[in-house]
């Protein structure tokens, strides 16, 4: 039975030209965590953490994203069309699959402030 | 040599359930480093990538398949497996399974000979 | 999602002649790109890597350039067992294809 819950830093607003931390967090659950899978609002997938294998992240993408912290990711040099949705995809033994959501609205002003906190979806 | 070997139905029904194992000899499929995916072509037609897996039972899929796809492993027989559901004509297609260095950054090395599924009443 | 054109479809050829093949990419792939040959009845084989480098066992007769968004596949000269379907995969993000390239016998 999966028991878990993920919890994530839900909408979070960031500067055009600034960086974002995309933070999910799993609780409730004593299952292992084997694979987070990072993937973006277009579909693209940004980058994969393997529990043996440690951080791919996609070429495509290694420019502008960072592993962590932790299972997290930080994405750099925002852009307007970085808005959207951002998908964390927690594999875990027993349990299975678990998927969390976060919204980024990325603003051009420059009194924007990061906002962020971690919700249940 | 590493060898790979699809196995399966050569016909399903639409709106059921595909499903195919793919035997991996010559080598372990619980070797670190690797995935293991698996590729269609429609007859006549090019290359799509349908997912992959690690050992460990971790995944990733092609985002515009994933709602109908489960890709399992079974590291005890060295093999894995696809399931792809609510199947129609769109799916016939020759199934290979392949090695999947994803963390190299690499295509696809080894492939099986391919299992031709044909979806029709 | 990256999507791979390759062009021509289609390749008419003679044996000895030098074939090229294209692969464009809608965004840059680097250098993160495979090509394979498919003859029928077959499942691909892989032929370069990385662009440039080619895989195990490939002859010289085969090489591939280019980076960023436009890729080449070139064959020197043509052996009869050189005729097949050519196709490119990028690996910048999730794997994709191109739609491939029938090189025939002209």
């Known amino acids: 039975m999966m028991t878990g819950t993920i919890e994530t830093t839900g909408n979070i607003s960031a500067k055009k030209g600034g960086s974002v931390i995309l933070q999910c967090h799993l609780s409730s659950t004593m299952a292992q965590v084997t694979q987070v899978n990072w993937e973006q609002h277009d579909h693209s997938l940004l980058a994969i953490r393997n529990a043996e294998l440690g951080w791919h992240i996609y070429p495509a993408f290694k420019d502008r994203v960072a592993p962590g912290p932790g299972l997290g990711l930080t994405l750099q040099s925002l852009t307007m069309n970085d808005t959207g949705e951002y998908f964390c995809t927690y594999h875990t033994y027993p349990d299975g699959t678990y998927r969390g959501r976060i919204f980024l609205e990325v603003l051009e002003s420059s009194v924007a402030e990061h906002s962020a906190r971690f919700q249940i979806p | 040599q590493l060898q790979l070997q699809e196995s399966g139905p050569g016909l399903v029904k639409p709106s059921e359930t595909l499903s195919l194992t793919c035997t991996v000899s010559?080598?372990?499929?619980?070797?670190?480093?690797?995935?293991w995916g698996w590729i269609r072509q429609p007859p006549g037609k090019g290359l799509e990538w349908i997912g992959s897996?690690?050992?460990?039972?971790?995944?990733y899929y092609n985002p515009s398949l994933k709602s109908r796809v489960t890709i399992s492993v079974d590291t005890s027989k060295n093999q894995f497996s696809l399931k792809l559901s609510s199947v129609t004509a769109a799916d016939t297609a020759v199934y290979y399974c392949?090695?999947?260095?994803?963390?190299?950054?690499?295509?696809?090395?080894?492939w099986g000979q391919g299992t031709l599924v044909t979806v029709s009443s | 999602e990256i999507v791979l054109t390759q062009s021509p479809a289609t390749l008419s050829l003679s044996p000895g002649e030098r074939a090229t093949l294209s692969c464009r990419a809608s965004?840059?792939?680097?250098?993160?790109l495979a090509w394979y040959q498919q003859k029928p009845g077959q499942a691909p084989r892989l032929l370069i890597y990385?662009?440039?480098n080619r895989a195990t066992g490939i002859p010289a007769r085969f090489s591939g350039s280019g980076s960023g968004t436009d890729f080449t596949l070139t064959i020197s000269s043509l052996e009869p067992e050189d005729f097949a379907v050519y196709y490119c995969?990028?690996?910048?993000?999730?794997?994709?294809f191109g739609g491939g390239t029938k090189v025939e016998i002209k």
């Open positions: 897996i690690y050992y460990s039972g971790s995944t």
């Open positions: 010559g080598g372990s499929i619980s070797s670190s480093s690797y995935y």
């Open positions: 392949a090695r999947d260095p994803l963390y190299q950054d690499a295509p696809f090395d080894y």
């Open positions: 995969q990028q690996r910048a993000n999730f794997p994709t």
């Open positions: 990385d662009a440039s």
């Open positions: 965004q840059s792939v680097s250098s993160y």
